[in-house]
């Protein structure tokens, strides 16, 4: 069980011996950031393997990340957020690869929560709401929402709307009457820091008013 | 405890698709390198595919590159096989599971897949 079959381990071209990525996230447990790394190959073997990230510090040089499992994680007050960080994979004292990388640009926002649909009989629409803990937060308050929403049987068919408040609203007829839709959204920072999308939210589910064939229009659930 | 429910096999005909998806819980997903194995009648269990933590990088059996595509959910700490122009000898009872396996590490059910004419 420890390679692949047929003709031994694969080498994937595009995949570097020790490349790895990173991701941070800013006051994501009251004060304190996080830096999570890890290996890009599946089949790098990380037993003796450490992360190290120097400079850009505060008050200290260097700082070794945690394992957890297969990925590689620090929590601390430490980031100073000016200027770039290096970061290495070692091996004991020696290092095998290492990065130069801005935290500020490699952001990965918390995902967003409490996704909820409304239907508006009067004004024949849905609005939806979500909330983001970084309404909160001092550094990365300003973010880019990608809601995606489908009919529930089409497994592939996702519409996708982009928008910087928390808050959209859905026409009710540009949407199938009677029909169960899925809907759920993520976040990417949007002014000054860079980075990544969050996790999509847990999704939601919504059911469209069937037509109400006197009228045209669709009855209210 | 740790858990994992394989689903998506079937019966589909040579150059068909399938897409197995696998449910896990009882670990934190998003920490561990995860990969599908599959098991032919009086074969052993081989390796077919693993995906990294982030779910940036892949590989795979040279048997099914350029055909299938491993990919993850670590929100919903899911993992997906989209197995495109299938073949004979992918026949086949299909496990997901962590990459690095310990002794303890259980199997789930599995999920056949069957490719015939």
């Known amino acids: 069980e420890s390679g692949y079959a047929q003709n031994g381990d694969l080498e994937d071209a595009e995949l570097d011996d020790y490349s790895f990525s990173c991701y941070s996230q800013l006051e994501v447990n009251g004060s304190q950031h996080s830096l999570t790394c890890a290996f890009e190959d599946p089949d790098v073997n990380i037993t003796n393997l450490e992360f190290e990230i120097c400079g850009a510090l505060v008050e200290v040089k260097c700082l070794n990340f945690r394992k957890l499992q297969e990925i590689y994680f620090i929590e601390t007050k430490k980031f100073l957020l000016i200027g770039k960080s290096n970061i290495c994979v070692k091996v004991g004292e020696k290092s095998l690869t290492c990065k130069k990388i801005d935290l500020t640009t490699i952001v990965k926002p918390e995902a967003p929560f409490d996704l909820s649909v409304v239907y508006r009989e009067g004004a024949n629409d849905f609005v939806v709401t979500f909330n983001t803990s970084h309404l909160q937060k001092k550094y990365v308050k300003v973010l880019m929402h990608d809601v995606a929403y489908r009919q529930e049987k089409d497994e592939n068919k996702w519409t996708h709307v982009n928008l910087s408040s928390t808050k959209l609203t859905l026409l009710q007829r540009k949407l199938q009457p009677a029909a169960m839709y899925e809907i759920k959204v993520r976040s990417i920072p949007d002014h000054y820091f860079k980075g990544f999308w969050s996790e999509w939210s847990p999704s939601y589910y919504f059911r469209t008013p069937e037509i109400n064939n006197s009228s045209g229009e669709m009855d209210p659930i | 405890q740790v858990q994992l429910v394989e689903s998506g096999g079937g019966l589909v005909q040579p150059g068909g698709s399938l897409r197995l998806s696998c449910a896990a819980s009882?670990?934190?997903?998003?920490?561990?390198?995860m990969s599908w194995y599959r098991q032919a009648p009086g074969k052993e269990r081989e390796l077919v595919a693993s995906v990294s933590p982030f779910g940036d990088g892949t590989r795979y059996a040279d048997s099914v590159k350029g055909r299938f595509t491993i990919s993850r959910d670590n929100a919903k700490s899911q993992l997906y096989l989209q197995m495109n122009n299938l073949k004979f000898e992918d026949t086949a009872v299909y496990y997901c599971n962590k990459r690095n396996l310990e002794i303890s590490d259980a199997w789930g059910q599995g999920t056949q897949v069957t490719v015939s004419s």
């Open positions: 009882g670990f934190t997903f998003s920490q561990r390198i």
